[in-house]
C-alpha cells in the first residue's frame, strides 16, 4: 500500500507511517515504527504539556512572582500552567497575567462604575447631575444628592460633581 | 514567613505503624505538591512519593508502595506520611517537602525532619 | 527508574581550587537540581533547574548539562563549601537522587 501523506487527528506522520501524538500531560520517549507503539511518559514534576504531542521535553510550569504583585491561583499539573492572579487591591497588565499593577482610584466628581478584579482595572464614570463623589476611592460608587425637600429643608448651596448640595431651614414668612 | 513543623521523634516497635505529621504555615498545601523524602542513617536521600492536597491523588516510588499512605488535611494545612510493617530498615529521618508554587524554585523549604527508630 | 550515579562519590579541594563534581543519568532528563546538606541539618536547594541558583548562593557556584550529564563546579572552593552534595532528577517519576558526592576542604 501507498505510505500516507496525511494522518488522523492525534497522529502525526513520521517515516512515512502514523504514529500516535502523545495526549496532554505526557512526553514523547520514542516514534512507534512498524511493530511498536508510540511511547510516552508523564511529564515530571513542575512540568507540563497542554496539548497531543510529540514534544521530548515538558514545558516549566510558570513562577507567580510575589516581586511582580503576584500569587497563585491554581498551581500547575501535568497538563495546565500554573494560572496567576494579582494580590489583594492590583490586578493584571496583560491577559498573560505577568505582573501586576494597583487598581487605578477615581477622583471627586467620578464615582466607581465597576469594582477592579485581579484581571481589570477599575472603571470610573463621570458623576451626573444629582450625583457626587467627594473623594478619590476605588470602591464609593457617586452618591445622590441629599434631597432637601423630604427633610422639609431648602437647598442652601447647589451641589456638584464633588459636593453634596448643604440644605437650611426654611424661611418663616412674617406675620 | 514559610514554616514547616514536623512532628516529634518516634521509637517503635517492629510490626508496628507510625504516622508522622507536617503543618505548614505562610502559604496553603493547596498551592504545593506534598513530597515526603527518606534519608536512613549514614546514607543519601531517596523520594518516598508526593501527594496533590487538591484531590488527594499521590505517586509513589514503587518500593514504598504499600509501606507508605500520604494524607493531607487541608482545614489544618497538614500533611501526614504513615508507614506501617515497620523494620529496622525504616529507621531513618523523615523530610517533608513541599513544591510550592509561590516559591521561586522547587524544594525550598525543608523541615527539621522526623526521626524514627524501629527498635524492641 | 532513572538511576543519578554522582562522581566522584569523596573529594577534597583546598581553598581557592576549582571543583567539578558530575552526576550522570542511565536516561536522559529535562533537567537536574543540586541540593547541599552538612552534617545534622537538612538539605537544601542550591542549584535549581540544571544551572539556577538558589537565593544566597554564592556565584562561584555553577550547574550545567543537558540529557544525561550534569555538573555542579566551584570556580574557588571556600571553607564553608565543604558539605555533601546530592543531584536530583524531577523530570521522570519516580524522582530519584544520586547517592551524593562528599566535597571536604583538604
Known amino acids: 500500500p501507498e505510505p500516507p501523506t496525511a494522518c488522523r487527528e492525534k497522529q502525526y506522520l513520521i517515516n512515512s507511517q502514523c504514529c500516535s501524538l502523545c495526549q496532554p500531560g505526557q512526553k514523547l520517549v520514542s516514534d512507534c515504527t512498524e511493530f511498536t507503539e508510540t511511547e510516552c511518559l508523564p511529564c515530571g514534576e513542575s512540568e507540563f504539556l497542554d496539548t497531543w504531542n510529540r514534544e521530548t521535553h515538558c514545558h516549566q510550569h510558570k513562577y507567580c512572582d510575589p516581586n511582580l504583585g503576584l500569587r497563585v491561583q491554581q498551581k500547575g499539573t501535568s497538563e495546565t500552567d500554573t494560572i496567576c492572579t494579582c494580590e489583594e487591591g492590583w490586578h493584571c497588565t496583560s491577559e498573560a497575567c505577568e505582573s501586576c499593577v494597583l487598581h487605578r482610584s477615581c477622583s471627586p466628581g467620578f464615582g466607581v462604575k465597576q469594582i477592579a478584579t485581579g484581571v481589570s482595572d477599575t472603571i470610573c464614570e463621570p458623576c451626573p447631575v444629582g450625583f457626587f463623589s467627594n473623594v478619590s476611592s476605588a470602591f464609593e460608587k457617586c452618591h445622590p444628592w441629599t434631597s432637601c425637600e423630604t427633610k422639609d429643608l431648602v437647598v442652601q448651596q447647589a451641589g456638584t460633581n464633588k459636593t453634596d448640595v448643604v440644605c437650611g431651614p426654611q424661611d418663616r414668612l412674617r406675620a | 514567613e514559610v514554616m514547616l513543623v514536623e512532628s516529634g521523634a518516634e521509637l517503635v516497635r517492629p510490626g508496628a505503624s507510625v504516622k508522622l505529621s507536617c503543618t505548614a504555615s505562610g502559604f496553603k498545601i493547596k498551592d504545593s505538591y506534598i513530597h515526603w523524602m527518606i534519608q536512613r542513617p549514614e546514607q543519601g536521600l531517596e523520594w518516598i512519593g508526593r501527594i496533590d492536597p487538591t484531590n488527594g491523588n499521590t505517586n509513589f516510588d514503587p518500593k514504598f508502595r504499600g509501606k507508605a499512605t500520604l494524607t493531607t488535611d487541608t482545614s489544618s494545612n497538614t500533611a501526614y506520611l504513615q508507614l506501617s510493617s515497620l523494620t529496622s530498615e525504616d529507621t531513618a529521618v523523615y523530610y517533608c517537602?513541599?513544591?510550592?508554587?509561590?516559591?521561586?524554585?522547587?524544594?525550598?523549604?525543608w523541615g527539621q525532619g522526623t526521626t524514627v527508630t524501629v527498635s524492641s | 527508574q532513572i538511576v543519578l550515579t554522582q562522581s566522584p562519590a569523596i573529594m577534597s579541594a583546598s581553598p581557592g581550587e576549582k571543583v567539578t563534581m558530575t552526576c550522570s543519568g542511565s536516561?536522559?532528563?529535562?533537567?537536574m537540581h543540586w541540593f547541599q546538606q552538612k552534617p545534622g541539618n537538612s538539605p537544601k536547594i542550591w542549584i535549581y533547574f540544571t544551572s539556577n541558583l538558589a537565593s544566597g548562593v554564592p556565584a562561584r557556584f555553577s550547574g550545567s548539562g543537558s540529557g544525561t550529564s550534569y555538573s555542579l563546579t566551584i570556580s574557588r572552593m571556600e571553607a564553608g563549601d565543604a558539605a555533601t552534595y546530592y543531584c536530583q532528577q524531577g523530570s521522570t517519576y519516580p524522582l530519584t537522587f544520586g547517592a551524593g558526592t562528599k566535597l571536604e576542604l583538604k
Open positions: 517537602v513541599p513544591n510550592y508554587y509561590g516559591s521561586r524554585y522547587p524544594f525550598s523549604y
Open positions: 536516561s536522559s532528563v529535562s533537567y
